[in-house]
């Protein structure tokens, strides 16, 4: 037992926030400014992420845990961990190597990031057109030319299983 | 499951206004846009004019712009059609509808059309 004991690594003692010591016998000691170690046993502290510039900090950095970094107003995070910002364009706009650009006739975009999208062919559906599309929004497509042809019944049709939640009224 | 009743329909004179409602009830929560469609004896039904319920954004057919006018108030879950200069040829009758979802189908593949049940509008000296 006692040759067990001394076989292992004393460093596996060291808890989440300190590192093991390899200049003071193997000591936990704890990360310095500025630094964190997320799990035990650890032999460095890891340095933490700074967020300047375009960045803005989300989360501060404490001695278990990384910061975490999010975009200044104007801009939105791209890649794992936010590790990029991009400009944001208007609703009805795409950001091209030119910046904001105007969606094309025929194109939508309803956010602030993203590409600009083909409206819906609401016929290749069978459907007929309800609302028109705009830059900013795709078309709404509405019933059916069957639906509207004389004798058709305009009965409403039976409850979904699970009801939709989208737009509020 | 969304419930629309019209009301407001009637006989009126060429040249006199109506105005048509449409109550929704149920789900409206989940109602994106909203028309009004007519129907004369023996044609198809016509859409008239429609509105996205979030900001206002209207459509009308080229037979009735400048004399109709549709809007919503979404505190009272309710669609309106202000029918003015009336003719003739706007006998018919006017059907509610509601559509839930954007594009042409919704979430996980389901689309819902509501349609109320009708109200008779009728134009004549």
């Known amino acids: 037992f006692e040759r067990t004991r001394s076989l292992q690594d004393p460093c596996s003692n060291c808890p989440a926030g300190t590192f093991c010591d390899n200049n003071r016998n193997q000591i936990c000691s704890p990360c310095p400014p500025n630094s964190f170690s997320s799990a035990g046993g650890q032999r460095t502290c890891d340095i933490c992420r700074q967020c300047k510039g375009v960045f803005r900090t989300r989360k501060e950095c404490s001695s278990t845990s990384n910061a975490e970094c999010d975009c200044t107003p104007g801009f939105h995070c791209l890649g794992a961990g936010c590790s990029m910002c991009e400009q944001d364009c208007k609703q009805g706009q795409e950001l091209t190597k030119k910046g904001c650009k105007d969606c094309c006739f025929g194109t939508f975009n309803d956010q602030k990031r993203g590409i600009c999208r083909p409206w819906t062919n609401c016929s290749l559906d069978g459907k007929s057109v309800l609302v028109n599309g705009t830059k900013e929004r795709d078309v709404v497509c509405g019933p059916s030319p069957a639906d509207l042809s004389p004798g058709a019944s305009s009965v409403t049709p039976p409850a979904p299983a699970r009801e939709p939640g989208h737009s509020p009224q | 499951q969304v419930q629309l009743v019209e009301s407001g329909g009637g006989v009126v004179q060429p040249g006199r206004s109506l105005r048509l409602s449409c109550a929704a009830s149920?789900?409206?929560?989940?109602?994106?846009?909203m028309g009004w469609y007519r129907q004369a004896p023996g044609k198809q039904r016509e859409l008239v004019a429609s509105?996205?319920?979030?900001?206002?954004?209207?459509n009308y057919a080229d037979s009735v712009k400048g004399r109709f006018t549709i809007s919503r108030d979404n505190s009272k879950n309710t669609m309106y059609l202000q029918m003015n200069s009336l003719k003739p040829e706007d006998t018919a009758v006017y059907y509610c509808?509601?559509?839930?979802?954007?594009?042409?189908?919704?979430?996980?593949?389901?689309?819902?059309?509501?349609w109320g049940q009708g109200t008779q509008v009728t134009v004549s000296s």
């Open positions: 149920g789900s409206t929560f989940s109602i994106v846009a």
């Open positions: 509808y509601a559509r839930t979802g954007y594009g042409s189908s919704w979430l996980m593949g389901h689309e819902y059309d509501y």
């Open positions: 509105i996205i319920t979030g900001d206002g954004d209207t």
